[in-house]
């Protein structure tokens, strides 16, 4: 059954002082002529129960649509079972597999068992009760105080294990498996274990900050990246493999940083600024990715203005130094007492003494 609950009834006591039936006869045959009491035998009392839908005016007939049951013989004329509560003999349990409707009509009848196959059983007393009852562990006590016999009984409706609500139609069974990770509160609501969410607590709560768009998890606190994404929170795209000076907004892109070009952003668009290749005050111009051109000042040539043309024309060697042109520019051979690239340093100033012999010569680019 999809739903689980039961209506329980427990007989508590019976008082049938004279041992009579509803029709006025004795349970055990004839009356004593003197005091009119039934003396031959006590009643063999048992109970029948009929549970049906709520009726404002109770009719004895019709089906017991919510269930019916009976006890075995549980006593004689008068008995009290309050001390032996929980004894199954005086309890009738009517299970049902529908949502408990809360309102009901209950018919309870006390009968005398004839212990005789020929003689039928006879009714001692009947009680009817219409009302409303919510599922609870607590019992509700009811009394039948009119007529031949008086009896007392208690009723309750209990939900089966894992069923909750006024109708016992809400199911919640704790679990820790593929289908969920939860306990159940007193109302049958699922309470997720830490790290899980969703109506069935089977959706893991990912690492705080994990991208909801590009990250996911099967285990609480984890963050697994979609293809093309990376990082602790799966919020960084993976650029095109081999991308050097580039980034991405979407996976596999290679968006070049300033001054870089080419498919892999590995081509320098500002070769002049990065490498400063032009020598001797040459002017550099970027002409294309990884390409440049040097404009050399007068007297210099070569791709990087590294070649000095007729460097001695400008008389760069001072103090009577003699100039000699070289592939890299010129070289000064200084007269005695002078040194430096252009023979402009006095050796007396530099060393504090006057040397003898030839001067020093230096290369100049």
């Amino acid at each position: 059954a999809d739903l689980g609950s039961q209506f329980e009834l427990e007989i508590l006591s019976m008082q049938n002082v004279n041992g009579e039936l509803q029709n006025g006869n004795c349970c055990g045959g004839v009356r004593n002529p003197g005091d009119r009491k039934c003396t031959r035998d006590e009643c063999d009392t048992y109970f029948k129960v009929c549970l049906k839908e709520y009726q404002s005016r109770v009719t004895a007939g019709g089906p017991c649509s919510f269930g019916s049951g009976s006890t075995p013989v549980i006593g004689g004329n008068t008995f009290n079972l309050k001390a032996s509560r929980g004894n199954d003999r005086n309890r009738i349990v009517l299970p049902f597999s529908f949502a408990w409707p809360r309102s009901y009509t209950l018919l309870v009848e006390a009968w005398d068992s004839s212990n005789d196959t020929i003689q039928p059983d006879s009714i001692i007393e009947k009680a009817s009760h219409s009302g409303m009852i919510n599922p609870s562990r607590q019992w509700q006590t009811l009394k039948q105080n009119t007529g031949i016999a008086h009896f007392e009984y208690q009723i309750r409706v209990t939900c089966d294990d894992h069923y909750y609500g006024f109708g016992c139609n809400k199911f919640c069974r704790p679990r820790d498996d593929f289908f969920g990770h939860y306990a159940c509160d007193q109302n049958g609501n699922k309470t997720c274990m830490e790290g899980w969410m969703g109506p069935d607590c089977n959706k893991a709560i990912c690492r705080q900050g994990c991208s909801p768009k590009h990250g996911s998890c099967k285990l609480p606190g984890d963050c697994r990246c979609q293809y093309g994404w990376q990082g602790l929170y799966c919020d960084k795209c993976i650029p095109h493999p081999g991308c050097v000076h580039g980034t991405c907004n979407e996976p596999w892109q290679c968006l070049c940083e300033t001054n870089w070009g080419g498919q892999l952003c590995d081509k320098d668009l500002n070769y002049c600024g990065t490498h400063q290749p032009c020598l001797n005050r040459g002017t550099c111009s970027n002409t294309g990715p990884d390409k440049y051109q040097c404009s050399c000042p007068e007297g210099y040539s070569g791709p990087n203005c590294e070649i000095a043309e007729h460097a001695c024309l400008s008389d760069p060697c001072h103090n009577r130094g003699s100039c000699k042109e070289t592939s890299s520019g010129f070289e000064c051979e200084c007269s005695p007492g002078w040194t430096g690239p252009t023979c402009s340093t006095n050796i007396d100033d530099e060393f504090g003494l006057v040397p003898r012999g030839s001067g020093h010569h230096h290369h100049h680019h």
Epitope: R173, A183, W196, K218
Partner: antibody
């Protein structure tokens, strides 16, 4: 750091009782359940039972049903395994493991020997 | 209860070998399978969860695959520290059940 520490194991006679403890730290105990898993010497792993975070529900393996009881004291961050009517086949290392994330976190285990 | 059957029960392999362990469930368990490694005297350690997800801190030489009833644990290049017993476990429904284990020994 999540930590589970079992204690209470030892030698007990058949028919006897023993109570194991599982002390938890490094996480909010009342937000997770606890499972008990055992391993007989030289054998595989066998699930024993579990308790929900609030301690309101327990479930057991058929082999221990009616003999073992799992409980928890959230004020002490501790789960318990009460073992009654012990049999020789209950001899094993008993582990507790945190619920809610497969069995990612285990204790070091405590050995229970049932022998006369 | 769902039965988990592991094979082989033991195997011998050398460092650097590729090792494959299989696990078969007695009924469909979707991807609700985990793999554990256990060394003598120690508690089991989670390696793989949800059939194919590598648990945090586990070396990438371990991988898992499968769904439904057939599952596989693969160690791509066996290392000295990988000699241990491996267990599969289903967490599809209660009670959770384990395979009988596969002992990986040095050849």
């Amino acid at each position: 750091e999540v930590q589970l520490v079992e204690s209470g194991g030892g030698l007990v006679q058949p028919g006897g009782s023993l109570r194991l403890s599982c002390a938890a730290s490094g996480f909010t105990f009342s937000n997770y359940g606890i499972h008990w898993v055992r391993q007989a010497p030289g054998k595989g792993l066998e699930w024993v039972g579990w308790i929900t975070p609030d301690g309101g529900y327990t479930d057991y393996a058929d082999s221990v049903k009616g003999r073992f009881t799992i409980s928890a004291d959230t004020s002490k961050n501790t789960a318990y395994l009460q073992m009654n009517s012990l049999r020789a086949e209950d001899t094993a290392v008993y582990y507790c493991a945190r619920a809610g994330s497969w069995f990612a976190y285990w204790g070091q285990g405590t050995l229970v020997t049932v022998s006369s | 209860d769902i039965q988990m059957t592991q094979s082989p029960s033991s195997l011998s392999a050398s460092v650097g070998d590729r090792v494959t362990i299989t696990c078969r469930a007695s009924q469909d368990v979707s991807t609700a399978v985990a793999w554990y490694q256990q060394k003598p005297g120690k508690a089991p350690k989670l390696l793989i969860y949800s059939a194919s997800f590598l648990y945090s801190g586990v070396p990438s030489r371990f991988s898992g695959s499968g769904s439904g009833t057939d599952f596989t644990l693969t160690i791509s290049s066996l290392q000295p520290e990988d000699f241990a017993t491996y267990y599969c476990q289903q967490s599809y429904t209660t009670p959770p059940t384990f395979g009988q284990g596969t002992k990986v020994e040095i050849k």
